[in-house]
């Protein structure tokens, strides 16, 4: 049985997908089916993350790398790694603890995930609405009055609902 | 779905060489260290040789070592046993498998005999 | 190296009947053991890791046991389709090693 020593630390010659045990004359082992090491010189080999329930497997786990989940259809991720799913609501809506619910008057929401945010205040940079917002959707601000050539009429900002002045992120 | 097809196998001459490959699908063949084992006509199963994931670390049973070659080619997604200085005893089928051990192809023989 | 010495070297059982393999190391090999299934023609199939594992779609009538150096294959009720070799082997070091084989018949 041939094999390569380090003068240094025996384990470092262990690569990936194997293990190492300083208490052996033999030190390297390969990692157990669903197990994995992502990089050499390991004295354990990690349990292979299972995607189940709700998680589903976007990748999987090899002998040198962890498997990883994304969520079902009508989930989404939240966290490092996907370490939570989320359900989904529609545009226009945000989840709270009831399930999901319609945003109020003056927010909105464009994505299937998040909170329902305030519509930009077109006033407080001295512009006009030029295309008023919806649940689904923030206004479109437009020139300032001063801009518009005379005789144009401006639109009158709807009043929000929440504080204003935050701008979508 | 993991499959590991073997093949290079055949009648070869005693101190002859025979090279055998083994295409890896439906798994990250890169991510794999990868097994060759080897079976003589009914007999149990031998370890021959193990590469580990990235090619750098090469193990060899006693018996085959100074005469055969593991390598592999992961942008081909396949293993490889070069084999030299070929003996009668050589004679197995042979067969691939990741280093979890846990899917193994479907072997190709090889017969050294003159 | 380390020696897997499986036994018996053959069986003949009844369908039904409950089987019991052993497996023994010549060394500690802590529960670095597997237990893997070979049909006349065909390439083995991995049915127990880690001694006792069962393997993703092996059925429940497998059972692994043991530890350090004695280890067991237990077929609860022997079924047509398992008349095939058994071998053990052990990963819990280079060179890996297998075991012989029993060689499981049918009445």
């Known amino acids: 049985f041939e094999r390569t020593r380090s003068l240094q630390d025996p384990c470092s010659n262990c690569p990936a997908g194997t293990f190492c045990d300083n208490n052996r004359n033999q030190i390297c082992s390969p990692c157990p089916p669903n197990s994995f090491s992502s990089a050499g010189g390991q004295r354990t080999c990690d349990i292979c993350r299972q995607c189940k329930g709700v998680f589903r497997t976007r990748k999987e786990c090899s002998s040198t790398s962890n498997a990883e989940c994304d969520c079902t259809p009508g989930f989404h991720c939240l966290g490092a790694g996907c370490s939570m799913c989320e359900q989904d609501c529609k545009q226009g809506q945000e989840l709270t603890k009831k399930g999901c619910k319609d945003c109020c008057f003056g927010t909105f929401n464009d994505q299937k995930r998040g909170i329902c945010r305030p519509w930009t205040n077109c006033s407080l940079d001295g512009k006009s609405v030029l295309v008023n917002g919806t649940k689904e959707r923030d206004v479109v601000c437009g020139p300032s009055p001063a801009d518009l050539s005379p005789g144009a009429s401006s639109v009158t900002p709807p009043a929000p609902a929440r504080e204003p002045g935050h701008s979508p992120q | 779905e993991v499959q590991l097809v073997e093949s290079g196998g055949g009648l070869v001459k005693p101190g002859g060489s025979r090279k055998l490959s083994c295409a890896a699908s439906?798994?990250?063949?890169?991510?794999?260290?990868m097994h060759w084992v080897r079976q003589a006509p009914d007999k149990g199963l031998k370890w021959v040789a193990y590469i580990s994931s990235g090619g750098s670390t090469i193990y060899y049973a006693d018996t085959v070592k100074g005469r055969f070659t593991i390598s592999r080619d992961n942008a081909k997604n396949t293993l490889f046993l070069q084999m030299t200085s070929l003996r009668s005893e050589d004679t197995a089928m042979y067969y691939c498998?990741?280093?979890?051990?846990?899917?193994w192809g479907q072997g190709t023989t090889l017969t050294v005999s003159s | 190296n380390i020696v897997m010495t499986q036994s018996p070297k053959s069986m003949s059982m009844s369908v039904g009947e409950r089987v019991t393999l052993s497996c023994k190391a010549s060394e500690n090999v802590g529960s670095y053991v597997s237990w893997y299934q070979q049909k006349p023609e065909k390439s083995p199939k991995l049915l127990i890791y880690g001694a006792s594992n069962r393997y993703t779609g092996v059925p429940d009538r497998f059972t692994g046991s043991g530890s350090a150096t004695d280890f067991t294959l237990t077929i609860s009720s022997v079924q047509a389709e398992d008349l095939a070799d058994y071998h053990c082997g052990q990963s819990y070091s280079y060179p890996l090693t297998f075991g012989a084989g029993t060689k499981l018949e049918l009445k």
């Open positions: 439906g798994f990250t063949f890169s991510e794999f260290g």
């Open positions: 498998a990741r280093d979890w051990v846990d899917y």
